[in-house]
């Protein structure tokens, strides 16, 4: 039973993005006064495992030797003290790469665009797929998504850029994911590199402005459309 | 060297079964890419029997004309790709491929063949 | 479904000849479409992927065009090597599909 306890942190080493095979350890702090601590996973038997504290007791080592898609999903992390389970710790969302393989990333017109005008970053998949991400090196919001609905699968997603500034510039890499889970990417796309010429250097658009003055992608995301129109792809960002 | 190599072909009474494989040398079949198999009857075209994604999960696609009689299947330890194919016919009698899909979405390398024959 | 009609069937030529072969498909490809060239007794030999671009070790009389679902093949000078069967090929792979290829195009001596 959740007391007033505060509830421990809950993160991943090296990441939370993680290639199929490689190991990850998650980490679960909580106080001094922890005598256990508890991993739940979302859709799975609770508790999903337990360990002892680590000296000086407040944080718990959870090691996953081998990444698969069994441990692909969303977290959460408890400790008991004397006076019994804390709160659960905010998610943390273990995504697995690897699970697929790579789409093409592209960019029509061009990758070399002039500030001001348009490009458009196309991932596509040769099977069908309903979810497309768009990563960004670097961005403070690298995570773009293009979700289908209603299950109606697509081969490719289209993520505009309008009007271009200086901002967009960069490395860019794609993935996409299939409706068995969203935890589970394919291997990415390989970089596509956006360079921005033009005589002046654009400002860098400041985060309180709207999507329709065209704020680069570190400050906001990007409005992703679907690969034909009516196409079933829900924008979606996070 | 980079190379798909097939075997298990051989004479099969209609109504039979036969396990295909097809070894991959030089890259690993757990990369990124699609794997397919292809077949081709005496004196007729190329005709896609289905694929699977190298990717962990292994999605399977399979031609509409196969309903269910053949399985496409990996053992990545192996670097092996099978093809089980049961309930043979004798207009499954084809010299049969596999072939790696590349980055560009063609079938840049294909094994040599084996041949499946279905006979009374 | 995605259907690959190839035509002609068989082109009948003399070395020298400028051949065009043409592949169309039911419904929008984009660029993704292979050409491949066959022997009897081999396996396909990839020539073009992705509507235009030639393979490794391909000879530059090998030419393809199109996009959508019209795609061509030329050979701008019929070599007595190119005497062949080719098959066009679409990129995608999903469950509704009866074939990735095309019929065939078989080119022989006039």
């Known amino acids: 039973q959740a007391g007033p306890l505060p509830k421990p942190t809950l993160w991943a080493e090296p990441g939370s993005v993680i290639s199929w095979g490689n190991s990850v350890t998650i980490w679960c702090q909580g106080t001094l006064e922890a005598r256990e601590y508890r991993l739940d996973k979302e859709e799975s038997p609770a508790p999903w495992d337990r360990q002892n504290p680590l000296e000086p007791k407040n944080k718990a080592r959870f090691s996953i030797p081998s990444m698969t898609e069994d441990y692909a999903g969303r977290y959460r992390c408890y400790y008991r003290s004397p006076v019994g389970w804390s709160q659960p710790s905010d998610p943390l969302e273990l995504v697995m790469t690897g699970a697929y393989s790579k789409p093409t990333l592209s960019a029509l017109p061009s990758p070399l665009v002039t500030s001001g005008k348009s490009v458009t970053l196309l991932c596509q998949s040769r099977s069908p797929m309903d979810t497309f991400l768009l990563i960004k090196e670097r961005a403070a919001h690298p995570l773009l998504h293009l979700r289908s609905e209603h299950g109606a699968q697509q081969h490719q997603a289209e993520f505009p850029m309008s009007p271009v500034t200086s901002v967009h510039g960069g490395t860019y890499r794609c993935f996409s994911s299939h409706g068995f889970s969203h935890y589970l990417l394919s291997h990415p796309s390989d970089p596509l590199e956006l360079i921005v010429s033009g005589s002046l250097e654009d400002p860098r658009p400041s985060p309180t402005r709207s999507v329709s003055t065209a704020a680069g992608p570190e400050d906001q995301p990007l409005m992703p459309t679907g690969s034909v129109p009516h196409s079933g792809l829900r924008r979606h960002w996070e | 060297e980079v190379q798909l190599v097939e075997s298990g072909g051989g004479l099969v009474q209609p109504g039979g079964s036969l396990r295909l494989s097809c070894a991959a040398s030089g890259f690993s079949l757990s990369s990124s890419y699609w794997i397919s198999w292809v077949r081709q009857a005496p004196g007729k075209g190329l005709e896609w029997i289905g694929s699977?994604?190298?990717?962990?999960?292994?999605?399977?696609y399979y031609a509409t004309w196969v309903k269910g009689r053949f399985t496409i299947s990996r053992d990545n330890s192996k670097n092996t790709l099978y093809l089980q194919m049961n309930s043979l016919r004798a207009e499954d009698t084809a010299v049969y491929y596999c072939?790696?899909?590349?980055?560009?979405?063609?079938?840049?390398?294909w094994g040599q063949g084996t041949l499946v024959t279905v006979l009374e | 479904d995605i259907q690959m009609t190839q035509s002609p069937s068989t082109l009948s030529a003399s070395v020298g000849d400028r051949v065009t072969i043409t592949c169309r498909a039911s419904?929008?490809?984009?660029?993704?479409l292979a050409w491949y060239q066959q022997k009897p007794g081999k396996a396909p030999k990839l020539l073009i992927y992705?509507?235009?671009t030639l393979a490794s070790g391909v000879p530059s009389r090998f030419s393809g065009s199109g996009s959508g679902t019209e795609f061509t093949l030329t050979i701008s000078s019929l070599q007595p090597d190119d005497f062949a069967t080719y098959y066009c090929q679409h990129g995608y792979i999903r469950g509704d599909l009866d074939n990735v290829f095309g019929g065939g195009t078989k080119v022989e001596i006039k």
């Open positions: 992705k509507a235009s």
């Open positions: 419904q929008s490809i984009s660029s993704w």
């Open positions: 072939a790696r899909h590349g980055d560009n979405w063609a079938l840049d390398l």
């Open positions: 699977i994604d190298s990717g962990s999960v292994g999605i399977t």
